[in-house]
């Protein structure tokens, strides 16, 4: 790259600096004699004037000027000459520079080259040598291989021969499996017909044991009847002994009304005479429907028509809308009596409600209620409870007022969860409420802190599942 | 089986705090709400507080209100009860108890006492100088 610079050295004359490439170059070019000092009335920067200049004067500057420009031209002449002569000086000397510096570096490189492959030489003669190493290692390995490989066929032929013994041995033991196949198949096929005859024998006891309930209960039935026949038949005998030994009797014997054969609920059977507590045929009210219904016949005066027992947990309580409806279990044992019937039954009169409880305890308690009734499936069979008294609890465990029974597949509480299925029964259920009689039934000591259980709280709380419960109706004026 | 236990109760002067602690098992703590209750000799049973685990609801008697603290961690299936600026009338006998958390009434936000079927066996807590 080039570059020219002009400045005045510290004695004031004018120097002349040329940059070219790494060299620079400095001129010092001498003085003109002729040039007019700076208090020259006409330097070239002083301010023109008004009056114009003699002629002469002109005339005289200007040749001074010329000789001046030709004195400066004949000194850039030379300039230009020395810088030439130098410059190819330079370029030379450059060149040369560049041509040594070139040979050097080729030398080096040579010389590195070599050493290169020297070492890789030496590299190759230890590779060779790894290579030779590694054929007989090799080579012995084969060796070994070889000798194992003749040992595994030995080994094989023995093998071979260990599994034809065996196939001998498991043709003969398949043979042995197939004689006791035939040999069970008949023994199955025999206890195949044993158990078909003992499940005809099962059904035919069955409708025998069927037969013989219902001749016990008719019997039982026709037991009080007698038992009546003849309590009346005593004092008929008797009344008539006494009208024979009065002196003014009349021969004339009263007329008997006709015996009453059907019975609305269990006070009517009381009534009639027949006091043994038991299962009694009741008649839906205005129908010649009949259901079995458990009477008792002992507590607080007898008369009660039971609706709901629990005792043991036999029976399963978690029903559908139509069991509860119709009813289930045995009114010998766990039973519910069926929702439709005690809707008709306390539709047309007024019936008192007792609740029995049992805990684990052996602890007793009841709740009685002046008036219950159950509203008709139109309404979910709504209870309704008026007038609590009774030692299970001064609050009724029944929300009041009634609430809508629900089950397992028709959920009418007021829960937005489904109580049935989280607490299991059939239940007037709230939300879900203080009670389920008809929750799961738990053995003792297994029956605290239950979510499921059968439940009265305002007598044990909550949580407590109950050894036994009774849920018994009578007419009010019984 | 379901259990809870309670601790942490004790004596404390009024003014002062106590932390009570419910331990459940044999349930998930976020299917059930739990609630602590307290009764006072010669008292009925009343209810405290309440949490929603699912929810992260929380319920406080007005009596209580502002000076007790419900919080669960179902890590540990616990339930604490903080109580702070404690009164001589706080004085009872703490339960904590659990009560399914669907089993509530249409428009209701809470349970009523009996709905709670699984009870701790409690935790005395006197407060007095």
């Known amino acids: 790259y080039s570059n020219f610079r002009k400045s005045v050295d510290s004695t004031g004359r004018r120097q002349y600096q040329v940059q070219n490439g790494p060299c620079s170059y400095t001129f010092l070019l001498p003085e003109t004699d002729s040039c007019r000092s700076s208090s020259s009335p006409y330097m070239s920067n002083a301010v023109q004037r008004d009056a114009p200049l003699d002629y002469d004067d002109s005339v005289q500057r200007l040749q001074v000027l010329e000789n001046i420009l030709e004195n400066n031209t004949q000194w850039l002449m030379k300039l230009e000459n020395y810088i030439q002569d130098n410059m190819k000086k330079e370029m030379v000397e450059i060149q040369q520079n560049v041509v040594q510096n070139q040979t050097a570096v080729m030398i080096e490189i040579g010389t590195s080259l070599l050493n290169q492959t020297a070492a890789q030489t030496r590299k190759l003669t230890d590779v060779e040598a790894q290579v030779l190493n590694q054929t007989t290692r090799l080579e012995l390995q084969l060796l070994q291989h070889s000798i194992s490989t003749n040992k595994l066929e030995k080994q094989i032929l023995d093998q071979t021969s260990e599994i034809n013994k065996l196939q001998n041995k498991n043709s003969f033991l398949e043979q042995k499996v197939l004689d006791m196949e035939g040999k069970h198949s008949e023994q199955l096929q025999s206890m195949k017909e044993q158990k078909d005859e003992l499940q005809v024998l099962v059904s035919k006891q069955s409708s025998v044991i069927d037969e013989l309930e219902k001749k016990l209960v008719t019997a039982t039935v026709n037991n009080s009847l007698l038992q009546k026949q003849q309590h009346d038949l005593m004092e008929t005998v008797n009344s008539l002994l006494t009208m024979m030994s009065s002196p003014n009797s009349k021969s004339s014997v009263a007329i008997r009304k006709e015996e009453q054969t059907t019975f609305r609920d269990c006070a009517e059977i009381f009534k009639s005479g027949l006091t043994t507590s038991g299962i009694y045929t009741l008649t839906f009210p205005n129908s010649t429907e009949e259901i079995k219904a458990y009477c008792d016949m002992d507590v607080g005066g007898g008369g009660w028509t039971v609706i709901q027992h629990r005792e043991d947990g036999s029976v399963d309580f978690q029903r559908t809308w139509k069991e509860y409806k119709e009813g289930f279990g045995s009114p010998l044992g766990e039973y519910w009596l069926g929702n439709e019937f005690v809707s008709q039954l306390t539709g047309q009169h007024r019936y008192v409600l007792k609740i029995q409880l049992k805990d684990w305890e052996g602890n007793e308690a009841h709740s009685l209620y002046d008036h219950f009734y159950l509203a008709g499936e139109e309404s979910n069979y709504r209870i309704h409870l008026t007038g609590l008294t009774g030692t299970a609890g001064k609050i009724s465990s029944i929300s009041q007022p009634g609430s809508d029974f629900s089950t397992k597949d028709s959920d009418n509480d007021k829960c937005i969860c489904k109580c049935s299925q989280m607490l299991s029964g059939g239940w007037w259920f709230d939300a879900c409420g203080p009670s389920n009689l008809n929750g799961q039934y738990y053995p003792q000591k297994q029956n605290t802190n239950k979510f499921n259980g059968i439940k009265w709280y305002y007598w044990k709380g909550s949580g407590y599942s109950l050894k036994a419960t009774t849920m018994m109706i009578r007419p009010a004026d019984f | 089986d379901v259990q809870l236990v309670e601790s942490g109760g004790g004596l404390v002067q009024p003014g002062g705090s106590l932390r009570l602690s419910c331990a459940v098992s044999?349930?998930?703590?976020?299917?059930?709400?739990i609630g602590w209750f307290r009764q006072a000799p010669g008292k009925e049973r009343e209810g405290v507080s309440a949490?929603?685990?699912?929810?992260?609801?929380?319920y406080y008697a007005d009596s209580v209100k502002g000076r007790f603290t419900i919080s669960s961690d179902n890590s540990k299936n616990t339930v604490y009860l903080q109580m702070n600026s404690l009164r001589p009338e706080d004085t009872a006998v703490y339960y904590c108890?659990?009560?399914?958390?669907?089993?509530?009434?249409?428009?209701?936000?809470?349970?009523?006492?009996?709905?709670?079927?699984?009870w701790g066996q409690g935790t005395l807590v006197t407060v007095s100088s």
């Open positions: 108890a659990a009560v399914p958390a669907g089993r509530l009434r249409y428009g209701e936000q809470w349970y009523p006492i009996y709905e709670y079927d699984a």
């Open positions: 949490i929603r685990s699912s929810g992260g609801s929380t």
């Open positions: 044999g349930i998930t703590l976020d299917d059930y709400a």
